[in-house]
Amino acid sequence: VGGYICEENSVPYQVSLNSGYHFCGGSLISEQWVVSAGHCYKSRIQVRLGEHNIEVLEGNEQFINAAKIIRHPKYNSRTLDNDILLIKLSSPAVINSRVSAISLPTAPPAAGTESLISGWGNTLSSGADYPDELQCLDAPVLSQAECEASYPGKITNNMFCVGFLEGGKDSCQGDAGGPVVSNGELQGIVSWGYGCAQKNRPGVYTKVYNYVDWIKDTIAANSHHHHHH
């Protein structure tokens, strides 16, 4: 909501999760792994990479089925705590200028840092208008105090807020699982919020920094060369 059409393939790590329709976004973090939101779990997922217009075959797409879908073991569907999911692709993505991985964070998100949020979610805060072309939004990371004041009792240490307290610009339904990138690192995963783009209700995002070890351990445990002892 309130964003702009991204320059074509300018977000090469952005993926669309498809189950006959686009239902969530995700981020490519290595040639065979995608990170998304825990609440984007489905038993069958096709990962679509290199997309810009999700309704038109433009020649840069790679459609790869999910081989493994691993939700965080402490995902809470009521609170959306630990809202993170890993998808292993059935075959490695072909990395090129339009499809490439995003780095995991080396430090937690800092208030005031500019970030890029992207997705194919609803562009209306009231009503429904799902775009075909990838939308981008530049937004600042908010302080944890601002975040907690916006959602009293709902924000865990695994969540942070990004956006505008005045409303008007936000992620929305269909953006879940997608990336929040600051300084070339995946800091957040689109998670939840009360409505979209409402005053004093900024978007809430999964704090990827808290899961770097889980991500690395899970990838290691689910790689072909892993041996059990």
Partner: antibody
């Protein structure tokens, strides 16, 4: 395979209550929601309400507000629909059906992919 | 509430015919529409979801199209087992609403 199995037919008097059960199997119960739909004899489909199996959030049809309660028991993967103060025009086949959760910022798509076999409820004095 | 208007309410057709059923929403619902088939005494069965995606196991003679307010279900070559009642359903927002149904009968 994925299936929803409903409780058996009921005959009730006007003013009574009925509680229909819907037992799910073949999938993780809390990853989906359950809708309830009824069909009066010779009529079309009427949506009654929806319940999230993971959060127990509900959304009821306005015309049934105050008379219907939907619940789930995650330990047995069973959904329940109770309808109170029954009237003769509540005579219908009642169906449960599986649909996507409405949660977070995932695309909301509230179609129904798997249906129970139906439970006939007859309200007659 | 979003009203769903289906037409025609009934259609007589022969085996091998092409049958088209339309559904109109009272306001835009993007692609969030489903089509169901129901035979007498049976539960509805999902045919098409998200306007045009074919449900697993459903024959390819069934297809769906449309976006916004106008949607179509097409049976390219009617088979004996296709004689049934068909319903559309908007899957965009609560309350969920169904069309009135279209009965496909043998001519």
């Amino acid at each position: 395979q994925v299936q929803l199995v409903q409780s058996g037919a009921e005959v009730k008097k006007p003013g009574a209550s009925v509680k229909v059960s819907c037992k799910a199997s073949g999938y993780t119960f809390t990853d989906y929601a359950i809708s309830w739909v009824r069909q009066a004899p010779g009529q079309g489909l009427e949506w009654m309400g929806w319940i999230s199996a993971s959060t127990a959030d509900t959304n009821y049809a306005q015309k049934l507000q105050g008379r219907v309660t939907m619940t789930t028991d995650t330990s047995t993967s069973t959904a329940y629909m109770e309808l109170r103060s029954l009237r003769s025009d509540d005579t219908a086949v009642y169906y449960c059906a599986r649909g996507d959760e409405v949660v977070g910022k995932r695309t909301y798509y509230i179609g129904m992919d798997v249906w129970g076999q139906g439970t006939t409820v007859t309200v007659s004095s | 509430d979003i009203q769903m208007t289906q037409s025609p309410s009934s259609v007589s057709a022969s085996v091998g015919d092409r049958v088209t059923i339309t559904c109109r929403a009272s306001q835009g619902i993007s692609r969030w529409l489903a089509w169901y088939q129901q035979k007498p005494g049976k539960a509805p069965k999902l045919l098409i979801y998200a306007a045009s995606s074919l449900q697993s196991g459903v024959p390819s003679r069934f297809s769906g199209s449309g976006s916004g307010t106008d949607f179509t279900l097409t049976i390219s070559s009617l088979q004996p087992e296709d004689f049934a009642t068909y319903y559309c359903q908007q899957a965009n927002s609560f309350p969920i609403t169904f069309g009135g149904g279209t009965k496909v009968e043998i001519k």
